[in-house]
Interface confidence: low
């Protein structure tokens, strides 16, 4: 009679994580008598997966009834597959011996490859806010996927970004992999409502990529522009001066009025108006009693935005006998006005 052969018909089997793997094995003869064992790997360090004769293997079930005398199907199912289960599995026939069974013949092996989905991408931005025109870095990380092949793309408001670098760890063979990507994004003044998206595509996702997002509202700081204006006279000896604080983000802002360098009033932006681009506007006014001043008055609107160094605009009031319509001050920040608004 022809000598027994151990047939493993599948050179490779591909299974998704969490599913059940079926590893097929048949023998061509009932002789010699002896049990079948399944191993992962070959050589002295091989790992026992299933022993027909003895042992407890809760994840393994046999496809057919191995207790039947004429059974030659030794296929097994392994449940709840994880990436750690990847490897080459061998179906090995033993010959009954005394005191121990002797290995008789092995199948050619079946390579089990596990497909594991990547975790949801986590996008993180810089620790500190940055202003428009600056370049900031965003990182995207995803873990636990297999096989190693993966595609990562970056988008800003739907537009694909090109300035990024991606690495997959580890470089060599592993049960599962992680991806780490860093993208560089140039901020603009209109980015308060912008989003950066990291998109990961993998064979396990069946064409439906995973996305992680970061809102640039958490990254950007848009510094305010200031304009100090003198309003028409309300009363005989009073002048109303307003400070327009425009296009700033985030809302955290404190404004201080100074008269000739002395603090007159400090207030925090509360009732702001929001612009379409997500930035804010705010206005503060100061009523100055001119009769209380014998000399010229230098009014300064000083703004501290989001913990940054203060910026200011100044406006000169000239104390004089005759009221006159006032203009607006457009002098540069941190400098006094070149034109003097006379009152």
């Amino acid at each position: 009679e022809e000598e027994l052969q151990v047939i493993q018909p599948d050179k490779s089997v591909l299974v998704a994580a969490g599913e059940t793997a079926t590893l097929r094995c048949t023998a061509t003869s009932l002789i010699p008598v002896g049990p079948i064992q399944w191993f992962r790997g070959a050589g002295p360090g091989r790992e026992l997966i299933y022993n027909q004769k003895e042992g407890h293997f809760p994840r393994v079930t046999t496809v057919s009834d191995l207790t039947k005398r004429n059974n030659m199907d030794f296929s097994i199912r392994i449940g709840n597959i994880t990436p750690a289960d990847a490897g080459t599995y061998y179906c090995v026939k033993f010959r009954k011996g005394s005191p121990d069974d002797v290995e008789f013949k092995s199948g050619a092996g079946t390579e089990l490859s596990v497909r594991a989905k990547p975790s949801a991408p986590v996008v993180s931005g810089p620790a500190a806010r940055a202003t428009p025109q600056h370049t900031v870095s965003f990182t995207c990380e995803s873990h636990g996927f297999s096989p190693r092949d993966i595609t990562l793309k970056w988008f800003k408001n739907g537009n694909e970004l090109s300035d990024f670098q991606t690495n997959v760890d580890p470089v060599g063979e592993s049960v599962s992999y992680s991806i780490h990507s860093t993208a560089k994004v140039v901020l603009t003044r209109e980015d308060v409502h912008s989003q950066v998206i990291c998109e990961v595509a993998h064979v396990t996702l069946q064409g439906d990529p995973l996305r992680g997002t970061a809102n640039l509202s958490e990254t950007i700081r848009v510094p305010p522009t200031l304009e100090v204006t003198q309003q028409p006279v309300r009363a005989e000896n009073q002048v109303n001066v307003t400070c327009q604080v425009r296009k700033f983000y985030p809302q955290r802002l404190q404004l201080t009025w100074l008269e000739n360098g002395n603090v007159s009033r400090t207030e925090t932006a509360s009732t702001v108006t929001e612009n379409k681009d997500g930035t804010y506007n705010w206005m503060s006014w100061l009523l100055v009693n001119v009769s209380a001043h014998r000399d010229d008055v230098k009014l300064t609107c000083q703004v501290e935005h989001d913990g940054q160094p203060a910026v200011s605009k100044s406006h000169d009031l000239k104390v004089s006998a005759h009221p006159k319509e006032q203009g607006s001050n457009t002098a540069a920040e941190n400098t006094g006005s070149n034109e003097r608004n006379i009152y």
Partner: antibody
Framework: SVEESGGRLVTPGTPLTLTCTVS????????MHWVRQAPGKGLEWIGI?????ATSYATWAKGQFTISKTSTTVDLKITSPTTEDTATYFC?????????????WGPGTLVTVSL | QIVMTQTPFSVSAVVGGTVTIKCQAS??????LAWYQQKPGQRPKLLIY???TLASGVSSRFKGSGSGTEFTLTISGVESADAATYYC????????????FGGGTEVVVK
């Protein structure tokens, strides 16, 4: 070989940049790491710079350190040192372009942060 | 994140004896593990990588074993020159990692 420089005594909050100068191999072929060791303590990995210039940092090091490079040097900037940053700082070459092992180490450079 | 735990913290050995140091990974890292030797005032030196492969020029008295989450460094025929601190390091990945090294094991040779 790799050699670190720039270690010195600084006051807390004073930014400090350490430089790692490499020779005998190209930074376009190998990832580079920074590792530190506080006096009497163990090795602490800070971060890596890959061949293309991308960086990764230990969770505790993000925001505190910045790694950058030129064609022959790798810099580690300690943005705002505290006394807890007192340590010997080592530059180490990875064994490949990517993360795995550290097979060439510099002798280290000592940074002391004190008032 | 992967955390590496080394035991013991310190171990004494006699010349000619055997020392065993263990390293445990919080996650399965396959064979992505290295061992380093560091003598006082010196830079670390790579001894073993891929869990069991001896680095160039390293004595065969050093042996690495293990895979998955449990790893062992064995020093046989201990010599006085083996007095040092030994560190394990996972080479698996660095995403969300606090430290890639174990805490270290000091070997004192008597």
């Amino acid at each position: 070989s790799v050699e670190e420089s720039g270690g010195r005594l600084v006051t807390p909050g004073t930014p400090l940049t350490l430089t790692c100068t490499v020779s005998g191999f190209s930074l376009s072929n190998y990832a580079m790491h920074w590792v530190r060791q506080a006096p009497g303590k163990g090795l602490e990995w800070i971060g890596i710079i890959y061949t293309g210039g991308a960086t990764s940092y230990a969770t505790w090091a993000k925001g505190q350190f910045t790694i950058s490079k030129t064609s022959t040097t790798v810099d580690l900037k300690i943005t705002s040192p505290t006394t807890e940053d007192t340590a010997t700082y080592f530059c180490a070459r990875g064994d490949r372009d990517g993360y795995a092992y550290f097979n060439i180490w510099g002798p280290g450079t000592l940074v002391t942060v004190s008032l | 994140q992967i955390v590496m735990t080394q035991t013991p913290f310190s171990v004494s050995a006699v010349v000619g004896g055997t020392v065993t140091i263990k390293c445990q990974a919080s996650h399965n890292i396959g064979s992505w593990l290295a061992w380093y030797q560091q003598k006082p005032g010196q830079r670390p030196k790579l001894l073993i990588y891929d869990a069991s492969t001896l680095a160039s020029g390293v004595s065969s008295r050093f042996k690495g074993s293990g895979s998955g989450t449990e790893f062992t460094l064995t020093i046989s025929g201990v010599e006085s020159a083996d007095a040092a601190t030994y560190y394990c390091q996972q080479g698996y990945g660095i995403s969300y990692v606090h430290n890639v090294f174990g805490g270290g094991t000091e070997v004192v040779v008597k």
